[in-house]
């Protein structure tokens, strides 16, 4: 047998060399096209396992999009034809609740999750006999990467986990599926930085294949929570990084989500974007915002992919994406996942399993309507899966997809066998579809959520609500005490009420200055290197949020540390959520908060509000009868007509859909 090269096994403490054999009847003369279904026999630790695989048809679309850049920095859009891809999911015969994510591109490579262990398999380098190495994922050496909890805490947590008798995976999955009965779809966009691209030999195909493999692994981990990962796009920074990656993880994350909001969202709709970087941050494996998956401004994370395998890296991305999905760290909580450590353990453990706590955190997100964007089954031009009627994704060429024949019995509008609409139906799904008919134009489909939002209406000829828009960033709100920022009026009292209950309000300015000048975890202007930054007086209103009149103590799945600081006759209340260094602190003042005359908070500094690029003269552009929306179009008051609010009409904008229906005036807002 060929001996594995040192590089291939240097990260393993133990492994076996095996030769899988194929059980399918059809002979495979050439490597492509790949079979839709295939079975193999593989050996692991003296046992033979039969594995059954089917192509993961929900993973990629017909027009899967890849963005790259040429030498001049011009954006290039490519739609590689990879419907017949080689990425599979499946199960181990006779092993209850097993799951597999494998690619069969050049040999077998991927992950097998059995009841009590996870295995990695990959082709043996330079073997001409289809030999592979198989190893327990526990036997992979990993750098001690972290998410900000000290090693002592991690050791203590691990020791506690070993003492407990974990519930079986069966029990866990049964409990989870009862909690999360409805499938959620995460439309994931991956961005690969220049250094990682260089590390892959500047081979775009290799980067693409690796990221599709990664998405398949993620899908195999998230499926236990009834969450599907749909990779909607990939961007490779082939010509140079489009953000500054100098500084700490927090700086890079901030730069990335700002870039995403400005450049990526407009190009390709998605729920979360994850940046893949080669550069490390001194032991921090990644960083992401918590509970922001549907946010225009913060649905993102950064993930360090250095000298580790894609299998190990998958658990880092699963962890950071988990934060976006509302999951906090497991450390210090009563969590179990049927393994020594779980994906949301802060120690980047390489785990494949989500814990009971993660399931509960995600459920909280969905109950609080933080996951509304995950309910839509991706549209044909966005869902990059090889078309397949019955997968509950409306693929190219389909009008609807109600799923299995049994599920389709309950769908009055969709013909299950053809994925076409029934003869009498105009539509089968969507916010503007009811009883198989388009709702009339002027039907409210997305109400105004704050004074900085605008409503959207059905247009009468589509099942979809108009795209979400809001008042342009920088428009004054709260009696000129604040600015609109991403559809919310960002002011201090409201932020205190979110954390400390409806009676709370912002503490006096002296509190902010006094507490935030300290540069500790309760008062700071961010984190740099390994220490908290003290706030200069001019930035104090952009550091840790200070509140008073506190009557409720917050609980967001974890119990935060709360500090009271006496200051000139009042008590200033602040909070440290102790979420770890890979999670931006929700106890800080929000970005976009007005911190002075003509100034807003950005990156914990009080900077000129001109950075918001507000350029709307409502008197000139909207004739004093409307406001500019996030597309820089007028949204007119009731009584005035778009586009410029200068003639009589029924309000709204060119983006909102018609606000009025001639057949039924009662529909008007």
């Amino acid at each position: 047998a060929a001996r594995p090269g040192f590089q291939q096994t240097s990260h393993l403490s133990s492994y076996e060399i095996i030769t899988p054999w194929r059980l399918t009847r059809e002979r495979r003369e050439a490597p492509r096209p790949y079979s839709k279904q295939v079975s193999y026999v593989i050996q692991a630790e003296g046992k033979e396992h039969i594995i059954h695989l089917e192509r993961n048809k929900d993973l990629l679309p017909e027009d899967f999009v890849v963005y790259t850049y040429n030498k001049e920095g011009t954006l290039i859009t490519d739609h590689p034809n990879i419907q017949n891809h080689c990425h599979y999911r499946g199960y181990v015969e006779g092993v209850h609740n097993s799951s597999i994510a494998l690619s069969d591109c050049f040999g077998l490579r991927g992950l097998l999750h059995l009841e009590n262990a996870s295995y990695g398999i990959e082709p043996l380098q330079n073997s001409s006999h289809f030999e592979h190495i198989i190893y327990r994922m526990d036997d992979v050496y990993k750098e001690p990467l972290k998410c900000g909890v000290s090693n002592k805490d991690i050791e203590k947590e691990t020791a506690k986990d070993e003492e407990e008798e974990p519930p079986s995976m069966t029990q866990l999955l049964r409990r989870r599926r009862a909690v999360l009965p409805q499938t959620r779809y995460v439309e994931l966009f991956i961005v690969v930085d220049k250094e990682r691209y260089d590390m892959m030999g500047r081979n775009q195909t290799a980067v693409r294949e690796e990221m599709i493999l990664l998405a398949n692994y993620l899908d195999s981990m998230y499926i236990m929570l009834n969450i599907r990962i749909v990779l909607v796009g990939l961007e490779i920074w082939t010509n140079g990084n489009l953000i500054n990656i100098v500084g700490g993880a927090g700086d890079v994350l901030g730069n990335f989500v700002q870039w995403r909001e400005k450049f990526l969202i407009t190009r390709r709709r998605h729920d979360s974007a994850q940046l893949v970087l080669k550069k490390g941050f001194g032991g921090t494996a990644g960083m992401a915002f918590v509970g922001t998956v549907c946010s225009r401004s913060h649905a993102g994370g950064i993930n360090v992919f250095g000298q580790i395998t894609v299998e190990t890296f998958a658990s880092i991305v699963a962890h950071e994406l988990g934060h976006n999905l509302g999951m906090n760290h497991d450390d210090g909580r009563d969590c179990s996942c049927g393994a020594k450590s779980c994906i949301m353990n802060s120690g980047a453990s390489g785990s494949r399993n989500f814990s009971s706590c993660s399931a509960e955190d995600f459920e909280k997100l969905t109950l609080n309507k933080g996951g509304n964007c995950l309910l839509n089954i991706p549209k044909p031009d966005e869902a990059y899966s090889a078309p397949s009627c019955g997968n509950k994704l409306v693929d190219a060429g389909e009008e609807c997809d109600c799923g299995t024949p049994k599920e389709c019995e309950l769908d009055p509008c969709c013909e299950g066998s053809t994925c076409k609409l029934k003869s009498f139906a105009e539509c089968a799904y969507g916010d503007c579809c009811k009883d198989c008919r388009f709702l009339p134009g002027g039907t409210l489909c997305r109400g105004k959520t704050s004074e900085c939002d605008v409503p959207e209406y059905c247009n009468g000829s589509s099942q979809f609500c108009q795209p979400d828009v809001f008042i342009q960033n920088g428009y004054p709100c709260q009696n000129n005490k604040a600015y609109c920022y991403n559809g919310m009026c960002q002011y201090y009292d409201a932020q205190c009420q979110v954390i400390f209950g409806s009676k709370a309000k912002a503490a006096p300015k002296d509190c902010f200055i006094e507490v935030n000048s300290k540069g500790d975890r309760f008062g700071n202007c961010g984190f740099s290197g390994n220490e908290y930054k003290k706030c200069a007086t001019g930035n104090a209103l952009c550091g840790k949020l200070q509140c008073e009149n506190v009557q409720e103590i917050p609980v967001f799945g974890i119990v935060p540390a709360i500090i009271q600081t006496p200051s000139r006759g009042t008590k200033c209340w602040g909070v440290d959520f102790q979420l770890g260094s890979d999670v931006p602190d929700p106890g800080m003042v929000n970005e976009g908060t007005k911190c002075g005359a003509g100034k807003i908070c950005r990156n914990f500094q009080c900077v000129d509000a001109s950075v918001l690029n507000y350029d709307c003269d409502v008197q000139k552009k909207c004739h004093g009868h409307g406001v500019c929306n996030s597309n820089k179009n007028c949204h007119c008051e009731n009584g005035w007509a778009p586009p410029n609010c200068e003639t009589k009409g029924y309000g709204g904008s060119v983006d909102s859909g018609p606000t009025y229906n001639e057949m039924n005036t009662a529909l008007r807002d």
Epitope: A482, A506, P508, D510, L541, Q546, G569, A597
Partner: nanobody
Framework: EVQLVESGGGLVQPGGSLRLSCAAS????????IAWFRQAPGKEREGVSC????????YYADSVKGRFTISRDNAKNMVYLQMQSLKPEDTAVYYC????????????????????WGQGTQVTVSS
């Protein structure tokens, strides 16, 4: 550009009165909290009186309560400090300060957490 200019200071005998004025430009007065501070030689700056932007609530330091009155004329963009029964210990440079009051700055025991400051006007109480 926000500017504050104080006037009305001078030399006055104990028991006398003065009216300090603060002319504001570059912003509308009614959306700002305005305060008067003073600093005597060799001492820390202390708050004398302030008027809140939100509801016009006024506060006074214990040492001036009943003797000083703060008021504002939004139409003229002016703030006044009427000082009566002056004492030698009121001798100091008096400063006018303004803040957009995004969080409270005008309150009992307030500190100098104001964004904009005037140059000051000298008040001397001496016989």
């Amino acid at each position: 550009e926000v500017q504050l200019v104080e006037s009305g200071g001078g030399l006055v005998q104990p028991g006398g009165s003065l009216r300090l004025s603060c002319a504001a430009s570059g912003f509308t007065l009614d959306s700002y909290a305005i305060a008067w501070f003073r600093q005597a030689p060799g001492k820390e700056r202390e708050g004398v009186s302030c008027i809140s932007s939100s509801d016009g609530t006024t506060y006074y330091a214990d040492s001036v309560k009943g003797r000083f009155t703060i008021s504002r004329d939004n139409a003229k963009n002016m703030v006044y400090l009427q000082m009566q029964s002056l004492k030698p210990e009121d001798t100091a440079v008096y400063y006018c300060a303004a803040d957009p009051e995004l969080v409270t700055v005008c309150r009992p025991g307030w500190g100098p957490a104001y964004d904009y400051w005037g140059q000051g006007t000298q008040v001397t109480v001496s016989s």
